[in-house]
Interface confidence: low
Amino acid sequence: VPRWRQQWSGSGTTSRFPETVLARCVKYTEVHPEMRHVDCQSVWDAFKGAFISKYPCNITEEDYQPLVKLGTQTVPCNKTLLWSRIKDLAHQFTQVQRDMFTLEDMLLGYLADDLTWCGEFNTFEINYQSCPDWRKDCSNNPVSVFWKTVSRRFAETACGVVHVMLNGSRSKIFDKNSTFGSVEVHNLQPEKVQALEAWVIHGGREDSRDLCQDPTIKELESIISKRNIRFFCKNIYRPDKFLQCVKNPEDSSCLSGIHHHHHH
């Protein structure tokens, strides 16, 4: 007799979730020598322990602490790239600019990127049918709490000049309700972080406005300045050109006399 199962509004756990997490962990630790010591079976156990047998609307950051401990990793100062609503370009950028890192370039972010998961109270099963939706069901669900936890930690450990890529095509270029706006901004440590530099990515070819003057960017500047962190903003007018220039900094259409990639 099939058991009754809670119906949530969100899509269910990604198929082959345990295998995917384990395979990603193995791949990551093979490619990143500094993480070779990580035991992927222990990582999976800690991940599983955070949500299996637990009511999926009552997950806490505490549940993820064993996993966070196992995935401890540091980013060199000046090399942290945060992003909001522009994940693909941020990832394309760090794939080329290999010495900069988004959260998804770190072990825990890499494991969970684009995946969904949840369990059920009092059973050892994974729910592949449905998982809680952040808006329609609850915010304390396994996926949302995971990203909040690791995003907080990622921001807390950042140092030097931190960069953030923002989507200039959105009505709110800086959104206080995004993970960046609600978690990361407030967890940058003023004693370690000298400045936050926002890169506002323009959408249209003809868009030559200075989006650094956008009211939401001014709001971000105010929040950051109040935290005693300096704020800078740059327009990236042509994202296609931007990536091309990151790949080929010596290209004549990118360079006009400055023979280094960026000023800090």
């Epitope: 800078f232 042509r238 220039c245 900094p249 990118c254 000023h263």
Partner: antibody, heavy 123, light 107 residues
Framework: QVQLVQSGAEVKKPGSSVKVSCKAS????????IGWVRQAPGQGLEWMGR????????HYAQKFQGRVTITADESTSTAYMELSSLRSEDTAVYYC????????????????WGQGTLVTVSS | EIVMTQSPATLSVSPGERATLSCRAS??????LAWYQQKPGQAPRLLIY???TRATGIPARFSGSGSGTEFTLTISSLQSEDFAVYYC?????????FGQGTKVEIK
């Protein structure tokens, strides 16, 4: 060697407009920024705005917003700065300058300057 | 906007002597700072960019140093053609801003 050649001196009445040109001879400027700076008699240098011809992206200093328009014609390697609603305080030498830099980050220093155009505003 | 403050306003130096000019930014401009020389009736001339890199054709007696908020232009042995007004300019944040200038005059 690139040179920036500016149009000649102008005398204008208050309330009118002036349009100063800046032509790059001996090379193109499309990969560069063109900045406009002014210097009132006996005073220091003041940024007015800049254009990145390749991107048709122009930005103005707040003080001049709404009064200044900077344009560029890539086909003739010429940049233009038009200042409207002239007043006596706008009497100054106006310079164009070529900006070198990684344009994606809009950070430029200026290595080549025009000879300057004196604009006198007087009734 | 970032305010650039130069000191002193006037520097009286004898030919052959060393001149040290200061420039302070109201907030960090990283190394995005340039120095220009201007003689009466002439356009400014780029001397230093990136806080410490000499522009093409600039003699070695001109050197720049500093980063963040404090910058220095040093002329190791003043020649007669070096008497002029010197401006610093930050290009880290728009609007770019100049200092008010330091006049180097013959003592």
């Amino acid at each position: 060697q690139v040179q920036l050649v500016q149009s000649g001196a102008e005398v204008k009445k208050p309330g009118s407009s002036v349009k100063v040109s800046c032509k790059a001879s001996g090379g193109s400027f499309s990969n560069y920024a063109i900045g406009w700076v002014r210097q009132a008699p006996g005073q220091g240098l003041e940024w007015m705005g800049r254009i990145i011809p390749r991107l048709d992206a122009e930005h103005y200093a707040q003080k001049f917003q709404g009064r200044v328009t900077i344009t560029a014609d890539e086909s003739t390697s010429t940049a233009y700065m038009e200042l409207s609603s002239l007043r006596s305080e706008d009497t100054a030498v106006y310079y164009c300058a070529r900006g070198l830099g990684y344009y994606l980050y809009s950070s430029y220093y200026f290595d080549i300057w025009g000879q300057g155009t004196l604009v006198t505003v007087s009734s | 906007e970032i305010v650039m403050t130069q000191s002193p306003a006037t520097l009286s130096v004898s030919p052959g002597e060393r001149a040290t000019l200061s420039c302070r930014a109201s907030q960090s401009v990283s190394s995005n700072l340039a120095w220009y020389q201007q003689k009466p009736g002439q356009a400014p001339r780029l001397l230093i960019y990136g806080a410490s890199t000499r522009a093409t054709g600039i003699p070695a007696r001109f050197s720049g140093s500093g980063s963040g908020t404090e910058f220095t232009l040093t002329i190791s042995s003043l020649q007669s053609e070096d008497f002029a007004v010197y401006y610093c300019q930050q290009y880290n944040n728009w609007p770019w801003t100049f200092g008010q200038g330091t006049k180097v005059e013959i003592k």
